[in-house]
């Protein structure tokens, strides 16, 4: 808290300008009118205030707006945003995408701070859903944003927003998140033709079920091994050697390099060695000839 003292004669600030950088903390408190500060917030960013001086300016705004700042002030906070706590931000009602962009710009190049996370949370909740423009903005600043959301939060993403997602935005997503995003992507891209569809859907395939992988295998898609390795193990296991060969096309020889990694390892264990040998890759670990394969999954389902 800054002690209340009278403003020295002739020091009363008529506008927010560079002369204020020479004011002591107590002078700023006494001589800068909070309402003036609120209307001229856009000037603060251009003035090299110290961190201590910014603390005083924040204190003045807090006193003026104890229930939370209006958006007209928030939009022009600039570096003062870095002084805000998540508790401060929870009082705000941010509805403009321009305001969001302005504040994200201040934090650009840094990890997502608790302040930014709270700001985004307030903004998205205020909008009711993650629309395309918001998603575009958030992933531009934080490529990993989408994967930081829970499956429940992702369920509010409309399929139309999926068009804004770039492959790198999904790099850190886990299978549970892709399970939610894949059906939305499938819906979003359903009217595209075969090769274009595959290019778009590829990043989401970690959530694809077996039947969709079987369908893709009929379309000459030539899936690369990096994508194949991200597929759900339970979706890959039922695929036949012929289907995997069609799915991967010329990339099928890459199975050898990944034969000890999941899902390739588990898939190999489910195939007949005879069938694996037809690939000519030297894959080992399949079911030997003459062995009977019992599918116990049906039995488990019935019991």
């Amino acid at each position: 808290e800054v002690e209340k003292t009278a403003c020295p004669s002739g020091k009363k600030a008529r506008e927010i300008d560079e002369s204020l950088i020479f004011y002591k903390k107590w002078e700023l408190e006494a001589c800068v009118d909070a309402a003036l500060l609120a209307t001229q917030m856009d000037r603060v960013n251009a003035i090299p205030f110290t961190y201590e001086q910014l603390d005083v300016l924040k204190h003045k705004l807090d006193e003026l707006y104890p229930q939370g700042y209006p958006e007209s002030v928030i939009q022009h906070l600039g570096y003062l945003f870095l002084k805000m706590s998540p508790e401060d931000i929870r009082k705000w009602n941010v509805t403009s995408l321009e305001t969001l962009k302005a504040l994200l710009e201040v934090n650009k190049g840094h990890e997502m701070s608790p302040q930014v996370a709270t700001l985004i949370d307030r903004f998205v909740k205020g909008r009711g859903q993650l629309d395309k423009d918001t998603l575009d903005t958030l992933t531009a600043f934080y490529p990993g944003y989408l994967c930081s959301l829970s499956p429940e939060e992702l369920s509010s993403v409309p399929p139309s927003s999926i068009w804004a997602v770039r492959p790198q935005d999904l790099d850190t997503c886990d299978p549970r998140q892709l399970d939610v995003l894949y059906p939305k992507a499938r819906l979003a891209f359903q009217n595209m033709n075969g090769s274009e569809y595959f290019v778009k859907i590829q990043s989401f395939l970690g959530g694809a079920p077996t039947e969709d992988l079987k369908a893709l295998s009929q379309q000459n898609v030539s899936m690369d091994l990096a994508t194949f390795m991200k597929l759900r193990t339970d979706a890959v296991l039922p695929l036949t050697v012929a289907e995997v060969q069609k799915l991967l096309g010329p990339h099928v020889e890459g199975l050898k390099a990944e034969e000890r990694h999941r899902p390739v390892r588990d898939w190999i264990l489910r195939q007949r060695q005879d069938d694996l040998d037809t690939l000519g890759l030297g894959l080992q670990g399949g079911i030997p000839n003459g062995y009977l394969v019992l599918d116990l999954s049906m039995q488990e389902a019935l019991s």
């Epitope: 492959p167 790198q168 790099d171 690369d224 091994l225 990096a226 194949f228 390795m229 991200k230 990339h251 020889e253 890459g254 199975l255 050898k256 390099a257 990944e258 034969e259 000890r260 990694h261 999941r262 890759l281 030297g282």
Partner: antibody, heavy 119, light 108 residues
Framework: EVQLVQSGAEVKKPGASVKVSCKAS????????MDWVRQAPGQGLEWMGD????????IYNQKFQGRVTMTEDKSTSTVYMELSSLRSEDTAVYYC????????????WGQGTTVTVSS | EIVLTQSPATLSLSPGERATLSCSAS???????LSWYQQKPGSSPRLLIY???NLASGIPARFSGSGSGTDYTLTISSLEPEDFAVYYC?????????FGGGTKVEIK
């Protein structure tokens, strides 16, 4: 420019552990496995294992099983190799090497990290 | 595991001469799964050839590779001063991946 930058040299006592980092840049981190290869002084190359940064799946050379742990941090595009229960014969230069998923050759190597184990 | 034996251990040649390096596997290696690396003192290895005969990016055409089964060869048609180094063959046909002991190509 594709780069693999490794952490600095380490001197450890027998029985201790060492953790070497390898930070990747200039390419899509999850499209390549990261392998670790070591080279004892005046000796040849020895493959230790690999990690798939996309899934976190690891494969270790049986020789190091139980002593080596490879991990990744996708948020920083960094992989780590920790070797425990160090002995003098673990004194070597440890390299991380990038391997495109689906291939078995290493097209980019880190600069190497010298680990010296001495009492 | 597959043991790769490289010969000779050291090859003493002059610039401009042809170098032939051998790599012999203890059991058959699928040719797609064999590669060669070059290493200079104090430096990291560098990929030269993959899949037995494919030149890696930026590697001059004087380097070539051949072979199948258990016998593989790296040839440098005409040695340049920068080619004097240690060369390693490497297989990933069988687990665990292994490297040969290396052939040192030195200036005569």
């Amino acid at each position: 420019e594709v780069q693999l930058v490794q952490s600095g040299a380490e001197v450890k006592k027998p029985g201790a552990s060492v953790k070497v980092s390898c930070k990747a840049s200039g390419y899509t981190f999850t499209d390549y496995n990261m392998d670790w290869v070591r080279q004892a002084p005046g000796q040849g190359l020895e493959w230790m294992g690999d990690i798939n940064p996309s899934t976190g799946g690891t494969i270790y050379n049986q020789k190091f099983q139980g002593r080596v742990t490879m991990t990744e941090d996708k948020s920083t595009s960094t992989v780590y190799m920790e070797l425990s229960s160090l002995r003098s014969e673990d004194t070597a230069v440890y390299y991380c090497a990038r391997r495109r998923i689906g291939t078995g050759y290493f097209d980019v190597w880190g600069q190497g990290t010298t680990v010296t184990v001495s009492s | 595991e597959i043991v790769l034996t490289q010969s000779p251990a050291t090859l003493s040649l002059s610039p401009g001469e042809r170098a032939t390096l051998s790599c012999s596997a203890s059991s058959s290696v699928i040719s797609s799964y064999l590669s060669w690396y070059q290493q200079k003192p104090g430096s990291s290895p560098r990929l030269l050839i993959y899949r037995t005969s494919n030149l890696a990016s930026g590697i001059p055409a004087r380097f070539s590779g051949s072979g199948s089964g258990t016998d593989y060869t790296l040839t440098i048609s005409s040695l340049e001063p920068e080619d004097f180094a240690v060369y390693y063959c490497h297989q990933w046909s069988s687990f665990p991946y292994t490297f040969g002991g290396g052939t040192k190509v030195e200036i005569k």
